[in-house]
Each structure stands twice: as structure tokens, then as C-alpha cells.
């Protein structure tokens, strides 16, 4: 899940771009994304 702190830190960036970066990291690290 996207934390409030990260959302504030990335204010102005699209939520999809955050999901995108998290998913790319998930494909590498196999961290559960739920």
C-alpha cells in the first residue's frame, strides 16, 4: 500500500506512476504488492 507520507513526498506525481515504480520493484524483489 502507498503510505500517506510517500503520497505527500511525491505530491504532484500521478498515483499510477507510484504504482508503476512499486510494481517494477516488485518484479525484481518479489515483494508482495497487496
Amino acid at each position: 500500500a502507498v503510505s500517506e507520507h510517500q503520497l505527500l513526498h511525491d505530491k504532484g506525481k500521478s498515483i499510477q506512476d507510484l504504482r508503476r515504480r512499486f510494481f517494477l520493484h516488485h518484479l525484481i524483489a518479489e515483494i508482495h504488492t497487496a
Epitope: 500521478s14 506512476d17 516488485h26 518484479l27 525484481i28
Partner: antibody, heavy 118, light 116 residues
């Protein structure tokens, strides 16, 4: 340098199966997610499947879900696409692609042609 | 539904500049996209990712003649000082994760002809 070489394409009858391979070199294969993307003759690109670095997670579009299976053997630096119940509309050049931390399909192979025809 | 729209063809003269457009479906206007180049009889090549604010990161070995910009739901690829090898098909693509499922769609592609 990153190198991806696809193989296993050919002519196959509708309803039959085929397995494609993608041999990877020039990078640590087990560290990256991999994908298959296809291109029907004279048409655009279509994403087909994605697998995580260790093979624990796989993703497919509805068009191939239940028929295609992506897998990998990290000890052999090889990516696979098992294609079952093939249809004429699966005729395409199939490309494998490697992700980076920044993007999904950063590096591509040269492709292998699959023709589904009776 | 996540959709990318591209004009089927474009043309420009050798040495000139050209701006290719990729339009996101209106409800996805903030999305980051990717641009790809496919030269005749070759596999695609990753050019860049392009964010809603126009910032972009280019792929390995991509010359700085290739740049990106954004306006609303439109994402642009500008190629300056056109060379003959820039004649190719250009595709935009976009991915998203929804309920732990991944989806990735490509635009229909733009065929760029370099004249002269």
C-alpha cells in the same frame, strides 16, 4: 551487453501447442522480471505475459490467460512461453523483453515467428 | 478502459524536426507512458518513459535528438535533426496494476517517413 535470443517458432496447426525459449546473456538473469510481447504481421505490439525475477508471480492479458504459461529457469538463463490451444490469431512475431528498475520493456530480442495455420 | 491513440502516419524532411503524439484516454491523463522505436525488420527499441509533467528518462544509447513533453492527456515525442535511420514505426505504451493484476497496452503506432 544485454542479449536476448528467441527460438522455437514455426508453423503449427490450430489447437496444437508450442514452446518458445529466450536465451539471455550479458546480465544477471535472475535479478529481473521478464516479458513476452507479440506482433501480428503488419500490426502493432501486444503484451502477452510477464514473470517476476524468481518466477513466483506471473501476469497475462485476458486474450491469452488460461492458454499461455510464462516460466523461467534461472540456472539456464532462459525464459519460456508455453502456448496451448493455439489459434490463427496467435500468429505473430514473439519478442522477449527485460525490465529495468525504471521501465517494463527496456531491452528486446529480435523475435521468433509463430504461424498458426492448417 | 486504458487506451492510447496515435496517428497512423507522419512525415518530415531530412534534418527537420517532427512531433509525434500519443493521447491517453481522458480518465488516465496523469499516467506515465513509454515510447518505443521499431525500425524496419527489427525488434522494438525502448526510447524513454514520459511523465505527466513532461520529465523523461531515456534508454541506453538514445541520442538527445529524441525528447519528450506532455500537455494534459497528450504525450509527445519530438525528434530533431531527422536522419534517414529515424524512419520507423513509433509506439507508445502504458502499464498499470489494478487489484494485483498487471495490464499493459500499446498505441496503434505511427509510421514515420523521412523525406528527401
Amino acid at each position: 551487453q544485454v542479449q536476448l535470443v528467441e527460438s522455437g517458432g514455426g508453423v503449427v496447426q490450430p489447437g496444437r501447442s508450442l514452446r518458445l525459449s529466450c536465451a539471455a546473456s550479458g546480465f544477471t538473469f535472475s535479478s529481473y522480471g521478464m516479458s513476452w510481447v507479440r506482433q501480428a504481421p503488419g500490426k502493432g505490439l501486444e503484451w502477452v505475459a510477464t514473470i517476476s525475477s524468481g518466477g513466483s508471480y506471473t501476469y497475462y492479458p485476458d486474450s491469452v490467460k488460461g492458454r499461455f504459461t510464462i516460466s523461467r529457469d534461472n540456472s539456464k538463463n532462459t525464459l519460456y512461453l508455453q502456448m496451448n490451444s493455439l489459434r490463427a490469431e496467435d500468429t505473430a512475431v514473439y519478442y522477449c523483453a527485460r525490465q529495468t528498475t525504471m521501465t517494463y520493456f527496456a531491452y528486446w530480442g529480435q523475435g521468433t515467428l509463430v504461424t498458426v495455420s492448417s | 478502459q486504458l487506451v492510447l491513440t496515435q496517428s497512423p502516419s507522419a512525415s518530415a524532411s531530412l534534418g527537420a524536426s517532427v512531433k509525434l503524439t500519443c493521447t491517453l484516454s481522458s480518465q488516465h491523463s496523469t499516467y506515465t507512458i513509454e515510447w518505443y522505436q521499431q525500425q524496419p525488420e527489427k525488434g522494438p527499441k525502448y526510447l524513454m518513459d514520459l511523465k505527466q509533467d513532461g520529465s523523461h528518462s531515456t534508454g541506453d544509447g538514445i541520442p538527445d535528438r529524441f525528447s519528450g513533453s506532455s500537455s494534459g492527456a497528450e504525450r509527445y515525442l519530438t525528434i530533431s535533426s531527422l536522419q534517414s535511420e529515424d524512419e520507423a514505426d513509433y509506439y507508445c505504451g502504458v502499464g498499470d496494476t489494478i487489484k494485483e493484476q498487471f495490464v499493459y497496452v500499446f498505441g496503434g503506432g505511427t509510421k514515420l517517413t523521412v523525406l528527401g
